[in-house]
Interface confidence: low
Amino acid sequence: ETVHCDLQPVGPERGEVTYTTSQVSKGCVAQAPNAILEVHVLFLEFPTGPSQLELTLQASKQNGTWPREVLLVLSVNSSVFLHLQALGIPLHLAYNSSLVTFQEPPGVNTTELPSFPKTQILEWAAERGPITSAAELNDPQSILLRLGQAQGSLSFCMLEASQDMGRTLEWRPRTPALVRGCHLEGVAGHKEAHILRVLPGHSAGPRTVTVKVELSCAPGDLDAVLILQGPPYVSWLIDANHNMQIWTTGEYSFKIFPEKNIRGFKLPDTPQGLLGEARMLNASIVASFVELPLASIVSLHASSCGGRLQTS
């Protein structure tokens, strides 16, 4: 049976979803156990011109030793105002000084990156040491690069389309995910559904997706269901500021009781099927319907509270 619910974008004041992901348009992670030098290459595209970027490097001890030296090659296509955090990391940064401005003195060794095309930048970086990771990111707002984490199956880093950087790199796109909503025809009441569909990633290892839900309405005003659908290897950690009905695939737990896993359900893996599920749960409004790449953290801010749905 077709569910009549015409999904339309909702205005940002009604709902916004931001997320952090390891999925990249192009990338690679190579093995480097106990590497004496970690080389990481980031190709950053900023389609809307000058941007701000928060870049954090985190070191994890490898068998009790720190990487001796880290080279980060930063290739950008337009001006970027960079907030760099790399405390205690023996970092050497290669970048184009005419495009990258630091929010504060970086306090690391720097060198000018030649104006080469991508392939030559990779070659230039590889001359300095084996490349541990490389990634192409479109319009990042923040990036977390974890050093000493690379566990790729490659011994050599070759950029490939649609890659999962695993724990090595997580990033948050500047543009929030598209949030859509609709009225479920023929259902009375004010129950609202928030549907999050996480698409399969490019590596199928077990993943926990942290879902933060912030609904701006008084607790008593809310009758809502949160529907989380993802690949079988995804479990969910829910951090919500309201009590609501939970309907998920896989297993889920709450941030306040993380050790208590609750078994989920087998849910449809199509938008139509998920809308049908919302209807079956007596939701009259789909306040937010979002499809995302495999993410590690998803934040949903919504203010519909069972009221009138506004689409943009």
Partner: antibody, heavy 118, light 106 residues
Framework: EVQLVESGGGLVKPGGSLRLSCAAS????????MDWVRQAPGKGLEWVGE??????????YYAESVKGRFTISRDDSKNTLYLQMNSLKTEDTAVYYC?????????WGQGTLVTVSS | DIQLTQSPSSLSASVGDRATITCRAS?????MHWYQQKPGKAPKPWIY???NLASGVPSRFSGSGSGTDYTLTISSLQPEDFATYYC?????????FGGGTKVEIK
Amino acid sequence: EVQLVESGGGLVKPGGSLRLSCAASGFTFSDAWMDWVRQAPGKGLEWVGEIRSQASNHATYYAESVKGRFTISRDDSKNTLYLQMNSLKTEDTAVYYCTRWRRFFDSWGQGTLVTVSS
Amino acid sequence: DIQLTQSPSSLSASVGDRATITCRASSSVSYMHWYQQKPGKAPKPWIYASSNLASGVPSRFSGSGSGTDYTLTISSLQPEDFATYYCQQWSSNPLTFGGGTKVEIK
């Protein structure tokens, strides 16, 4: 074409000193990580040490067997790599090769023989 | 230090034979490089990053392996292949070479 030419080898008494040179051409020397590798007569290869590029602040690393006695330096303006060997021991007798590290040792000199003997 | 143990230390074979040299690391390494050396000459890069042939190396050579076990294989020995082969790692300080495998004519 990349060329590495070592010089400065010879006979020296135990406890003595010697300075080896390696003249490089055919590539941007200042960007290169340069190493010394040695080979005792009839034996295998042994890494001696490395000096990294200008971009890496000319950082140096040494094998435990030579630490404190050998010093690697470079003169980027002359495209020359050096190995200063002090307090030489008979076990330092070897052919010393100058090499370039670029993912692996992709270029080697012909080597220069150092004999430490009384 | 990571020790690299090559086996066999010497190998006698005939032209046309298949030859396999192994290099075992005392702990896991991310990749292995191989060099060929002929008497009185400097070593030459032969295979890098475990399986990539260096410039000018014939396709009868191949490299494979991961973790602690790596292999150099010559599918059909030619007269010019008789030499000593060394493996080398630098996944961990210090850089180390294997003891070498001498491939001799039977």
